[in-house]
């Protein structure tokens, strides 16, 4: 995943002695809040493991890498990185891991510059449908957004709300359409069942989409025909059984894709053939070799390229009148 | 029925090279990859390797990628491991196993002792 | 990658007792199997997808769990049930990982 990062050698650290001494003036515009790490010579802030369970007010102006990183932060609040002078420069936002469970509508709002968002590792309980498009409208303004991390953002079953978890993400990827011009998203480890077939059509600019270690039984809704600059498709780890027609032609039609479909589950029965015959001929899926047959057991860990129409067969349904007890 | 056969000793010198065989049959050799295992007295089960025989594709654990080297010959349905610079470390029993998810079916095991 | 650690290390039981041994798992797996190894003699397959007897298996072993943390119970031991029993973690693409095995001797 592709988390802000830094080059940053040398970091001025705001000593937590001074923090009582320096708030009772007006902050200056390019100070260290307390218990974070600044390089202004990297345009980088870190505050990471700090238990924090806000955002500092008094983030410098430069700050181009912010890491809020290992942190108590729960709610991200409307307008949550607001300032005046506004953070103009800020382009990478690295949340991940900060014990949040809520996002409001607008929490990114006034952040002209933001490319890269991580709010991974985040039991998010409830994300507004307007966390990143900032207002309710049928159409936003665009979002400047073209990374969003969003690995391991479910929460545990029992504090989720009573709605679809799948649903909740994609609406906030979806509101405004403010996220056209997102080229990579994440989406790993989060328990989805199901992809809502609308998500993808709207999110036309994709290049990288990871969906690996969900539990995905099924792409048979899902479309992406209109992913024609997705370039890499990671679908390892999933609940996966097999890829139909439809989905076999649409990935092929897409001119720069790199498909992952390692670790899933695949029943070789008479269903698999023209995944089979697709495999053969296809060279989108990387390690395609490695794909081998989870049942039935006579089946189990053969080389789904090393099998062939007679290999695969359905045992018949028999009609209720020959079926034993 | 499946059978992977290995020789049940090899006695090599510390230094030198060894190649041990994995022989198959009861099955479609080219249809399922083959792993390697190796397993120290009293110890525990640690993956080598594998080979993919239809193609030969390997993937290694990182702790043996200069230790050993995978290699098939289909008209024989034989696997190879090659240990190479051997010490007494490497003096153990390693196992060819069938498998995918799993690993379904495994050999005797071949007992390697490096011994001056 | 995922670490498996299988408790206890050396257990032992009486004929007829029930045994149970855990695998514990240091991130979430969707399943594990079960290989037992009886001295002197190769690996087997024993239980598969944490929970499927292979053909042979006699049902007093079944295999249990979710997420991190699985077993392996014998609801009766047998003397021929005493063997070195390994976990390792459901997967198609390397490494391929096992447990640190559990010795399960008769009393």
């Known amino acids: 995943s592709s988390s802000p990062t830094s080059s940053a050698s040398s970091f001025s650290s705001s000593a937590p002695f001074l923090a009582s001494a320096v708030s009772a003036q007006p902050p200056l515009p390019d100070q260290c809040p307390a218990l974070c790490e600044c390089s202004e010579a990297a345009r980088t802030v870190k505050c990471v493991n700090r238990n924090l369970t806000e955002v500092p007010t008094d983030l410098p102006a430069y700050v181009r890498n912010l890491f809020l990183t290992g942190n108590q932060l729960a709610v991200l609040p409307a307008g949550a990185f607001a300032r005046r002078p506004p953070l103009a420069e800020l382009a990478a936002l690295n949340l991940s891991g900060s014990r949040l469970d809520e996002v409001r509508a607008g929490a990114f709002e006034h952040l002209p510059s933001l490319r890269q968002l991580d709010l991974s590792h985040n039991p998010l309980a409830d994300l507004s449908p307007f966390a990143f498009s900032g207002s309710n409208a049928s159409v936003s303004a665009p979002s400047p957004l073209v990374e969003l991390i969003l690995n391991h953002i479910v929460p545990p079953e029992d504090e989720r709300q009573n709605r679809s978890f799948e649903g909740m993400v994609v609406a906030a990827l979806l509101a405004g359409r403010a996220l056209q011009g997102l080229r990579r998203l994440e989406l790993a480890s989060n328990h989805f069942l199901y992809l809502p077939r609308d998500v993808l059509a709207q999110l036309p600019s994709l290049r990288h989409l990871d969906l690996s270690n969900n539990s995905l039984v099924s792409l048979t809704y899902v479309s992406f025909r209109n992913l024609t600059h997705l370039e890499s498709l990671h679908l390892e780890d999933n609940a996966l059984k097999v890829l139909h027609n439809g989905t076999l032609a649409e990935l092929q039609g897409l001119p720069h894709i790199r498909v992952f479909l390692d670790n899933n589950p695949w029943v070789c029965d008479c269903h698999m053939a023209d995944m089979v015959t697709w495999l053969k001929e296809t060279e989108v899926v990387q390690g395609k070799d490695r794909l081998t047959c989870a049942y039935p057991e006579k089946m189990r860990n053969r080389v789904l390229l090393e099998l062939n129409s007679a290999d695969l067969d359905c045992d018949p349904i028999l009609p209720p009148s020959l079926q034993t007890s | 029925q499946v059978q992977l056969q290995q020789p049940g000793t090899e006695l090599v010198k510390p230094g030198a090279s060894v190649k041990l065989s994995c022989k198959a049959s009861g099955y479609t050799f080219t249809s399922y990859w083959m792993h390697w295992v190796k397993q120290r007295p009293e110890q525990g089960l640690e993956w080598i390797g594998n080979i993919n025989p239809s193609n030969g594709n390997t993937n290694y654990n990182e702790r043996f990628k200069s230790k050993a080297t995978l290699t098939v010959d289909k008209s024989s349905s034989t696997a190879y491991m090659q240990l190479s610079s051997l010490t007494s470390e490497d003096s153990t029993v390693y196992y060819c196993a069938r498998g995918g998810w799993d690993f379904d079916y495994w050999g005797q095991g071949t007992t390697l002792t490096v011994s001056s | 990658q995922v670490v498996l650690t299988q408790s206890p290390a050396i257990m032992s039981a009486s004929p007829g007792e029930k045994v149970t041994m855990t695998c514990s798992a240091s991130s979430s797996v969707r399943y594990i199997h079960w290989y037992q190894q009886r001295s002197g003699t190769s690996p087997k397959r024993w239980i598969y997808d944490t929970s499927k007897l292979t053909s042979g298996v006699p049902v007093r072993f079944s295999g249990s769990g979710s997420g991190t943390s699985f077993s392996l119970t014998i609801s009766s031991m047998e003397a021929e049930d005493a063997a070195t029993y390994y976990c390792?973690?459901?997967?198609?693409?390397?490494?391929?990982?096992f447990g640190g095995g559990t010795k399960l001797e008769i009393k």
């Open positions: 390792q973690q459901w997967t198609s693409k390397p490494p391929w990982t």
